[in-house]
Interface confidence: medium
């Protein structure tokens, strides 16, 4: 978790004074309780927004947007603090706004907005915004939370991201995968405009089970610059085993901007409706 | 050249778990799984499962389901298996394997004890 | 279960005799099985697999046959380093599973 660029935050808005600060995620308030507290936000949203760095790099960012409640407690809101929880790592970010000014009572509701937060595609997110002061021991919670789900490199917006087109999210390798004779497979896949290697999973299932019967690796070596966007024909050898007729081919590119973090790609063949009768297992069958 | 080395002899009380550890060295670990056999003493080889050391895909056998868990840290390209709840007739040697049907390399073995 | 019968379960027999073992699966494994020689004290040695494909350094003196529900390891000639146990394995279907093992002992 990060914020875009270390440019300077700006909470500040007609009628407000406000700067935006680091936080440790924990308000001197809650080691000091104050008497009068602020209510909680009001209709906390969340979305995917997309913002450019300095240096022009595209990030997809969480856009938070929340108002206040219409009630007296704004007299002692002093600012809030937004938190960013990573839902599978617990790793977790917070600012503090921090009001320099009183806030009034005016024509409109108060709007506060912040788009800073770096966000990672497929990932889940808890965000919550704190009113400060925080309220003393067993007073009514004065925060709202809600989780954010972030969208995979597939999503249109996002594969123009950079860290989806870092991970190869712009490689689009159309894979066929076609049965022969002789328990094998053919997979056909388009290879990307780099000279770096592949690397082929084939995992087999039975019919309606998930556990694999069968996983096998096949290493393809780094093209040639005139073999970019050519087609790559591989032909892989099954293992005759028992009701073990599903296939999953998996493709795992390792570009030079991602290494062993790359997307991988998929494609799956089902069982026949009416599986052949098992042939013998030539005897020049390589060991897997 | 290609080696398993597993973990010391280990002794357990009824009840108890156990993990034993596989470090592989010679060879690209994710490119084969590694399979897990046992073997009492006086008696013979009993297959207890295996795990994909590239996918994280396991295949365990049926009388060990629930009780025992197969990973591995492709940092360290080590493979473990944990067995819990153990019994006295839980006390063999277990051994790792490399290669999910036909195991072409083995580790030394792990003598697992388990008495009160 | 496939369930995998080695027979005989002891063989005695003297150095540089041939010594024959049998394997029996009580369904068709096809052509999905290795034999493996187990030493006290050691870990199992893989010697062939594919029911007759020599593993990495096995010397020509083992050879496998068969396929389907009967396999046949042969030792040409019994040199002393080969009194061992020797274990049969399928792999055609899950779970996998070893035959008792054939004790190879000198006559």
């Known amino acids: 978790l990060r914020l875009l660029d270390h440019r300077a935050l700006v909470c500040s808005q007609p009628g407000l004074n406000c700067t935006v600060k680091n936080s440790t995620c924990l308000d001197d308030s809650w080691i000091h309780p104050r008497n009068l507290t602020p209510s909680s936000p009001k209709d906390l949203q969340i979305q995917l927004h997309f913002a450019h760095t300095q240096q022009g790099d595209l990030f997809p960012v969480a856009h938070i947007e929340w108002t206040l409640q219409t009630d007296a407690s704004i007299l002692y809101l002093e600012g809030a603090e937004l938190s960013v929880l990573q839902l599978n790592t617990n790793e977790r970010l917070c600012v503090r706004f921090e009001f320099l000014s009183k806030l009034r009572h005016h024509h409109r509701r108060w709007r506060f907005t912040f788009s800073h937060f770096v966000v990672d595609p497929d990932q889940e997110y808890e965000v919550t915004v704190h009113h400060l002061p925080k309220p003393i021991p067993d007073g009514d919670p004065n925060h709202q939370s809600k989780n954010f789900l972030v969208p995979d490199c597939e999503h249109a917006r996002m594969k123009v991201t950079t860290p989806c087109m870092s991970s190869g999210s712009l490689w689009d390798p159309n894979i066929t995968v076609e049965t022969l004779e002789a328990h094998q497979l053919r997979v056909s896949f388009t290879l990307w405009n780099e000279s770096t290697h592949y690397q082929i999973l084939l995992t087999s299932f039975p019919h309606m089970e998930n556990h694999s019967c069968f996983e096998h690796m096949h290493h393809i070596p780094a093209p040639r610059p005139e073999e970019f966007h050519q087609r790559s024909n591989v032909t892989l050898t099954l293992r005759n085993l028992k009701g073990c007729c599903r296939h999953q081919v998996q493709i795992q590119p390792f570009f030079s901007s991602c290494l062993n973090d790359c997307l991988r790609h998929s494609a799956t063949v089902s069982c026949p409706e009416m599986p052949d009768t098992p042939e013998p297992i030539p005897d020049y069958m390589p060991l897997w | 050249q290609v080696q398993l080395v597993q973990s010391g002899a280990e002794v357990k009380k009824p009840g108890a778990s156990v993990k034993v550890s596989c470090k592989a060295s010679g060879y690209t670990f994710t490119r084969y799984g590694i399979s897990w056999v046992r073997q009492a003493p006086g008696q013979g080889l009993e297959w207890m499962g295996w795990?994909?050391?590239?996918?994280?895909?396991?295949n365990y056998a049926q009388k060990l389901q629930g009780r025992v868990t197969m990973t591995t840290d492709t940092s360290t390209s080590t493979a473990y298996m944990e067995l819990r709840s153990l019994r006295s007739d839980d006390t063999a040697v277990y051994y790792c394997?490399?290669?999910?049907?036909?195991?072409?390399?083995w580790g030394q073995g792990t003598l697992v004890t388990v008495s009160s | 279960e496939i369930v995998m019968t080695q027979s005989p379960a002891t063989l005695s027999v003297s150095p540089g005799e041939r010594a024959t073992l049998s394997c029996r699966a009580s369904?068709?494994?096809?052509?999905?099985l290795a034999w493996f020689q187990q030493k006290p004290g050691q870990a199992p040695r893989p010697l062939i697999y594919?029911?007759?494909t020599r593993a990495t350094g096995v010397p020509a003196r083992f050879s496998g046959s068969g396929s389907g529900t009967d396999f046949t390891l042969t030792i040409s000639s019994l040199q002393s380093e080969d009194f061992a146990v020797y274990y049969c394995?399928?792999?055609?279907?899950?779970?996998?599973?070893f035959g008792g093992g054939t004790k190879v002992e000198i006559k």
């Open positions: 394995q399928q792999y055609d279907n899950w779970p996998l599973t």
């Open positions: 394997a490399r290669r999910q049907l036909y195991f072409d390399y």
């Open positions: 369904q068709s494994v096809s052509s999905n």
């Open positions: 594919d029911a007759s």
């Open positions: 795990i994909s050391t590239y996918s994280g895909n396991t």
